[in-house]
Interface confidence: medium
């Protein structure tokens, strides 16, 4: 099949390298975190970012790998097994489960690549799918048929 | 900041180009869809994928742009303004809001790039942040101080 022409280097700059540099800016979730007085507690706040106001609250865990692109990924970690009551914001409601929402993200790993005679010739990129948890969601438990 | 060494082309293949080809596999959310008898309704199912069992249910809308990498992105669209009652799975509970969780995703656009004298020299990649809605989350409304 045909595909786009190769990207053009600017003034001798290798564009793959440019791509690598561009992609290393961490992109955490959009809403800036505000101070959370109970950052690890199983409660739904009335202020702060979405992940602390959710009745399935979660925290973000940084996953950094300097041989991966992007280097910084964030995994959601649920703070409660069940959902928090909308009424109180603190007691758990066993009728709802707090479940992780997963996503298979495309990432690239750098690997040594070898020349024609097996010599080490810099680094190549290897594409992989990487499972990331995005958020915790309050769901009704599955009814087994 | 430091960055990786340049990627090595394999047998003359431009690695940026390789990156383009690798990156085009659509990667939708992980959990496969099961039948949803009310795909657009404001209710929390007891079976099916996470987005239909959530008490802040959502659907996915395809956003395709052939000049963007990835070409296919999916935006969550909330089906209810409030959260669905855990008790009934259908009635809304006005004490909770169904809010979109946003993420700034790194995407690349292909743009014509120009040589030293302004000549068109194939395509370059331009990095952008692109706002994607990942899911709908049931939250306690903000209390205005």
């Amino acid at each position: 099949y045909s595909h786009w022409p190769s990207c053009c280097p600017s003034k001798g700059q290798d564009t793959s390298e440019e791509l690598l540099r561009w992609s290393t800016v961490p992109v955490p979730p959009l809403e800036p975190a505000r101070p959370n007085r109970h950052p690890e507690s199983c409660r739904a706040s009335e202020d702060g970012p979405l992940n602390s106001r959710a009745i399935s609250p979660w925290r973000y865990e940084l996953d950094r790998d300097l041989n991966r692109l992007p280097q910084d990924l964030y995994h959601a970690r649920c703070l409660c097994p069940h959902c928090v009551s909308l009424q109180t914001g603190s007691h758990m409601d066993p009728r709802g489960n707090s479940e992780l929402l997963y996503h298979n993200q495309t990432v690239f790993y750098r690997r040594p690549c070898h020349g024609e005679k097996g010599t080490h010739k810099g680094y190549c990129l290897e594409r992989r799918l990487y499972r990331v948890s995005l958020a915790c969601v309050c769901v009704r438990p599955r009814v087994m048929g | 900041y430091s960055h990786w060494p340049s990627c090595c082309p394999s047998k003359g293949q431009d690695t940026s180009e390789e990156l383009l080809r690798w990156s085009t596999v659509p990667v939708p959310p992980l959990e496969p869809a099961r039948p949803n008898r009310h795909p657009e309704s404001c209710r929390a199912s007891e079976d099916g994928p996470l987005n239909s069992r959530a008490i802040s249910p959502w659907r996915y809308e395809l956003d395709r742009d052939l000049n963007r990498l990835p070409q296919d992105l999916y935006h969550a669209r909330c089906l209810c303004p409030h959260c669905v009652s855990l008790q009934t799975g259908s009635h809304m509970d006005p004490r909770g809001n169904s809010e979109l969780l946003y993420h700034n995703q790194t995407v690349f656009y292909r743009r014509p790039c120009h040589g030293e004298k302004g000549t068109h020299k194939g395509y370059c990649l331009e990095r952008r942040l692109y706002r994607v809605s990942l899911a709908c989350v049931c939250v306690r409304p903000r209390v205005m101080g």
Epitope: Y1, S2, H3, W4 | L20, R21, T24, P26, P28, P29, E31, P32, A33, N36, P39, P49, N51, R59, Y60, E61, L62, R64, L66, L69, Q71, D72, Y74, R110
Partner: antibody, heavy 121, light 107 residues
């Protein structure tokens, strides 16, 4: 062998709804989006929308003004088209068509169902 | 929506003739164009994708060319089994749109 088998012909009254099914076999159902295309008598092909069976993600042709709903049952490898508020001009053959893709270059409907004739009168 | 216009709407040619069908887009669509063949009473079949790539199993007498707004489907040597209606389709943007079709007959 890839096959798309659609449900049988339907006759409906104006204002009613119709639901057409498309059973896929011979490939990984969740790996390809499914398109729906309509052909009214003597008219050009008209794209109605598509659905990704993997996550239920959809894109609709807004010319149908929200009358179209696409769904899938992955356990049965079946896609469904529902069209409501039927009018006489909805009479035609409705096709499901698998969408193949390659890198940056193409999205193309490479396998088609045999078509379902819907008559509204 | 992107409008696709084919010409001619119908044509009659002899076996062995070189036949050309054109398709024009209302805006530039790069090479994001497919061609389909629909024989009388049959289902549409993919013929050419991405302007010029032949789908598997399609005879080499079919070819496609063009870019931007103007595209061409060519049959180098018309055969009796080529009697059909031919449709172009753009996929640059949703909604996908088709040309009105070109009906090809044998003289």
């Amino acid at each position: 062998e890839v096959q798309l088998v659609e449900s049988g012909a339907e006759v409906k009254k104006p204002g009613a709804s119709v639901k057409v099914s498309c059973k896929a076999s011979g490939y990984s159902f969740s790996g390809y989006t499914m398109n729906w295309v309509r052909q009214a008598p003597g008219q050009r092909l008209e794209w109605m929308g598509l659905i990704n069976p993997y996550n239920g993600g959809t894109s609709y042709n807004q010319n149908f003004k929200g009358r179209v709903t696409l769904t899938v049952d992955t356990s049965a490898s079946t896609a469904y088209l529902e069209l409501n508020s039927l009018r006489s001009e909805d009479t035609g053959v409705y096709y499901c068509a698998r969408e193949d893709f390659d890198s940056w270059t193409y999205f193309a409907m490479d396998y088609w169902g045999q078509g379902t004739l819907v008559t509204v009168s | 929506d992107i409008q696709m216009t084919q010409s001619p709407s119908s044509l009659s040619a002899s076996v062995g003739d070189r036949v050309t069908i054109t398709c024009s887009a209302s805006q530039g669509i790069s090479n994001y164009l497919n061609w389909y063949q629909q024989k009388p009473g049959k289902v549409p079949k993919l013929l050419i994708y991405y302007t010029s790539s032949l789908h598997s199993g399609v005879p080499s007498r079919f070819s496609g060319s063009g870019s931007g707004t103007d595209f061409t489907l060519t049959i180098s040597s018309l055969q009796p089994e080529d009697v059909a209606t031919y449709y172009c389709q753009q996929y640059l943007a949703f909604p996908y749109t088709f040309g009105q079709g070109t009906k090809l007959e044998i003289k």
